[in-house]
């Protein structure tokens, strides 16, 4: 946990393991005031390491739907549309926080969970393994 | 919210706006049981669209530290190390959930917040705008 002095106006915690269990308001505030309003919408198709997005659904998780990227090829696509296998497509992964219902099926009780998701793919120069 | 029948073994909610405010256990469970154990560790440097990682810190947020990717070039790096400006390096962005202390400085009260982060970069063929 992060040691921050308690403000007198804070909600009181009845949890003796404070602050292991906290109150979370699920009214999501959206901070996406990005100067790039256009998301990675069509990058998956235009990339030299293109990917497909797969829907991962789990009603016991919040958010229940997460999109997972899978690289289309092991190599990278050249200007002529053919795949160059001297380069490698690799997934760009990120650890994200989700809420997992705990106990299961409970609508108002969750546990924080870290999951690794693949967001897209990038083209990299391969690691050359030199044989001794 | 997601309408899921309440299990009789669930913690009771005293919030009249149930399930707007929920209990969350901050003991993070780590689900990273990936068949690809190798993370995107050195991809930022080996990519044809390399990026730098910038530390974004906010003590009022959980997690307090988030790493943001910034593409190094507008173009993409060729095999000879030179930049090809006929291709574009673009950030792959993802919306993630974080917890924002609300009221501020309170250790046990949060609000869910969506933020857009750049996870890495990929090399794309540019969109050609034809002038009429």
């Amino acid at each position: 946990g992060i040691a921050i002095p308690r403000n007198s106006g804070c909600p009181n915690s009845e949890d003796k393991n404070f602050p292991r269990t906290v109150m979370v308001n699920l009214n999501i505030h959206n901070r996406n005031t990005s100067t790039n309003p256009k998301r990675s919408s069509d990058y998956y198709n235009r990339s030299t390491s293109p990917w497909n997005l797969h829907r991962n659904e789990d009603p016991e998780r919040y958010p229940s739907v997460i999109w997972e990227a899978k690289c289309r090829h092991l190599g990278c696509v050249k200007a002529d549309g053919n795949v160059d296998y001297h380069m490698n497509s690799v997934p760009i992964q990120q650890e994200i926080l989700v809420l997992r219902r705990e106990p299961r099926h409970c609508p108002n009780s969750f546990r924080l969970e870290k999951i690794l998701v693949s967001v897209g793919c990038t083209c990299v120069t391969p690691i050359v393994h030199h044989v001794a | 919210g997601i309408a899921i029948p309440r299990n009789s073994g669930c913690p009771n909610s005293e919030d009249k706006n149930f399930p707007r405010t929920v209990m969350v256990n901050l003991n993070i469970h780590n689900r990273n049981t990936s068949t690809n154990p190798k993370r995107s560790s050195d991809y930022y440097n080996r990519s044809t669209s390399p990026w730098n990682l910038h530390r974004n810190e906010d003590p009022e947020r959980y997690p307090s530290v988030i790493w943001e990717a910034k593409c190094r070039h507008l173009g993409c790096v060729k095999a000879d190390g030179n930049v090809d400006y006929h291709m574009n390096s673009v950030p792959i962005q993802q919306e993630i959930l974080v917890l924002r202390r609300e009221p501020r400085h309170c250790p046990n009260s949060f609000r869910l917040e969506k933020i857009l982060v750049s996870v890495g970069c990929t090399c794309v063929t540019p969109i050609v705008h034809h002038v009429a």
């Epitope: 998956y44 797969h54 690289c71 497509s89 693949s118 793919c121 | 990936s34």
Partner: antibody, heavy 124, light 113 residues
Framework: QVQLQESGPGLVKPSETLSLTCTVS????????VSWIRQPPGKGLEWIGI???????DYNSAFKSRVTISVDTSKNQFSLKLSSVTAADTAVYYC??????????????????WGQGTLVTVSS | DIVMTQSPLSLPVTPGEPASISCKSS????????????LAWYLQKPGQSPQLLIY???TRQSGVPDRFSGSGSGTDFTLKISRVEAEDVGVYYC?????????FGQGTKVEIK
């Protein structure tokens, strides 16, 4: 259970277009990609092409100029069209589901469920 | 295109005895990023469509008996059946899933002696 069923005319005239349909059940179309493979009589297997879960396609360059694979998700159907056919296109045509593996971050190009195949003869 | 070469093309076997099929690829199927070899094995029983036995060289598809095992790396691969059973007869194909177009070996016909 997972099922794939090919259908279409068993006889096609030379220079015409071969059209086959693959009707699937028992799995989610948005998750899986589907490939078409053919097997000439008494010969081995030849991969024709794939349609990915998002609708994009990749074709074997040997067929590229004359093949089209598409999907109609509302009917759970995939289709294969092969134009300008010759006697060399006589084969059993299979549709097959590409394996989907959770927590693995590449598309798979091995097939874990196959249709029973349909024989197409090209002859005048 | 990648050429997949199987040997032998015909394999007479005795039930209860082991059997082995070789598959060679014209290029390495080892992906440096994850150290996986992109080779699969299928069995096409008489009058049936192919069924997946093994992928990534050695991972058995669910429901496949453990008498089937795969090994190898780079360009040389082997499928072994520890004790052949009558139901194992048919044509075995190796397939590379690394390079497009994804190509198959010419097949090995396994039959009971």
């Amino acid at each position: 259970q997972v099922q794939l069923q090919e259908s279409g005319p068993g006889l096609v005239k030379p220079s015409e277009t071969l059209s086959l349909t693959c009707t699937v059940s028992g799995f989610s179309l948005p998750s899986h990609s589907v490939s078409w493979i053919r097997q000439p009589p008494g010969k081995g297997l030849e991969w024709i092409g794939i349609i990915w879960n998002q609708g994009g396609t990749d074709y074997n360059s040997a067929f590229k100029s004359r093949v089209t694979i598409s999907v109609d998700t509302s009917k759970n159907q995939f289709s294969l069209k092969l134009s300008s056919v010759t006697a060399a296109d006589t084969a059993v045509y299979y549709c097959a589901r590409n394996a989907y593996i959770t927590d693995y971050y590449y598309e798979n190009y091995f097939m874990d469920a196959w249709g029973q195949g349909t024989l197409v003869t090209v002859s005048s | 295109d990648i050429v997949m070469t199987q040997s032998p093309l015909s394999l007479p076997v005795t039930p209860g005895e082991p059997a082995s099929i070789s598959c060679k690829s014209s290029q390495s199927l080892l992906f440096s990023e994850n150290q996986k070899n992109y080779l699969a094995w299928y069995l096409q029983k008489p009058g049936q469509s192919p069924q997946l036995l093994i992928y990534w060289t050695s991972t058995r598809q669910s429901g496949v008996p453990d008498r089937f095992s795969g090994s190898g790396s780079g360009t040389d691969f082997t499928l072994k059946i520890s004790r052949v059973e009558a139901e194992d007869v048919g044509v075995y194909y190796c397939q590379q899933s690394y390079y497009t177009p994804y190509t198959f070996g010419q097949g090995t016909k396994v039959e009971i002696k």
